[in-house]
Interface confidence: low
């Protein structure tokens, strides 16, 4: 399996590095996190992509002023966006 990988980037432009996953990784994972107050103020946005042996959380998580979206897929370089 191959996935794109990056850590805490502000744009997908910096998340286009392909990585060969380890033998135990079955998933490509994208984690996008943003912080703000509703739709009014945004403090920041970060994007991380990685190989993973499991899909950590199947749905988006909303934690007050911060929200996190996690998506998983299982094919060659599938975590493009």
């Amino acid at each position: 399996l191959m996935c794109f990988s990056c850590l805490n980037q502000k744009s997908n432009l910096y998340c286009l590095k392909p990585t060969i996953c380890s033998d135990q990784d079955n998933y490509c994972v994208t984690v996008s996190a943003s912080a703000g107050i509703g739709n009014l103020v945004t403090f920041g946005h970060s994007l991380s992509k990685t190989c993973s042996p499991a899909c950590p959380i199947p749905e988006g998580v909303n934690v007050g002023v911060a929200s996190m979206g996690i998506s998983c897929c299982q094919s060659f370089l599938c975590n493009f966006s």
Partner: antibody, heavy 123, light 106 residues
Framework: EVQLVESGGGLVQPGGSLKLSCAAS????????MHWVRQASGKGLEWVGR??????????YYADSVKGRFTISRDDSKSTVYLQMNSLKTEDTAVYYC??????????????WGQGTLVTVSS | DIQMTQSPSSLSASVGDRVTITCKAS??????VDWYQQKPGKAPKLLIY???NRYTGVPSRFSGSGSGTDFTFTISSLQPEDIATYYC????????FGQGTKVEIK
């Protein structure tokens, strides 16, 4: 409760073939890579090979000692993994275990094991 | 292929003793080392994964440490039920087991 049950072992002549099965229950079989590990009598453990999942085209990987002779396959509808052993040699005599990782608590090692099935290659 | 050299091959210790087993990888395997316990006639059981993490339900007297090429498995206070053979295994590239260490009670 997770269970792995191997079957199909027995006595076979050198050069012969045998197909082992491992029936799994208690977890989502189709999402997990499955492994075979063997152990000759009084000897240590030897990893034989593994098969991954459908999204990665059931990719297989084998130990050099069995490459070209053994084939691992799986039937997700039956929650079963198979080990087809051809051109068997006397040194293939061993107890064969199937094993699976436990992805659900962050463990990717061989957390689950079957009871093993004995394969004896002898004339 | 990566080789795992485990030592000693056997040891005898008294109940309550601290027991240490080492495993040396022929090349860097990061933290991708597990430790298994096998009793006669039984399948192996996972004790430690990723070098130092105790698997679910494993007693706290079992521990592991190390990274790179040198790894250690410790039983802090040997119990009669710990009589078994212990194996290290690397999963960095394919999967290779050490030769095993047979632990006996004096």
């Amino acid at each position: 409760e997770v269970q792995l049950v191997e079957s199909g072992g027995g006595l076979v002549q050198p050069g012969g073939s045998l197909k082992l099965s491992c029936a799994a229950s208690g977890f989502t079989f189709s999402t997990v890579a499955m492994h075979w590990v063997r152990q000759a009598s009084g000897k240590g453990l030897e990893w034989v090979g593994r098969i991954r999942t459908k999204p990665v085209n059931y990719e297989t990987y084998y130990a050099d000692s069995v490459k070209g002779r053994f084939t691992i396959s799986r039937d997700d509808s039956k929650s079963t993994v198979y080990l087809q052993m051809n051109s068997l040699k006397t040194e293939d005599t061993a107890v064969y275990y199937c094993s699976a990782p436990n992805y659900y608590d962050g463990t990717y090692s061989f957390a689950y094991w079957g009871q093993g099935t004995l394969v004896t290659v002898s004339s | 292929d990566i080789q795992m050299t485990q030592s000693p091959s056997s040891l005898s210790a008294s109940v309550g003793d601290r027991v240490t087993i080492t495993c040396k990888a022929s090349q860097n395997v990061g933290s991708n080392v597990d430790w298994y316990q096998q009793k006669p006639g039984k399948a192996p059981k996972l004790l430690i994964y990723k070098a130092s993490n105790r698997y679910t339900g494993v007693p706290s007297r079992f521990s592991g440490s190390g990274s790179g090429t040198d790894f250690t498995f410790t039983i802090s206070s040997l119990q009669p039920e710990d009589i078994a053979t212990y194996y290290c295994m690397q999963s960095e590239t394919k999967y290779t087991f050490g030769q095993g260490t047979k632990v006996e009670i004096k």
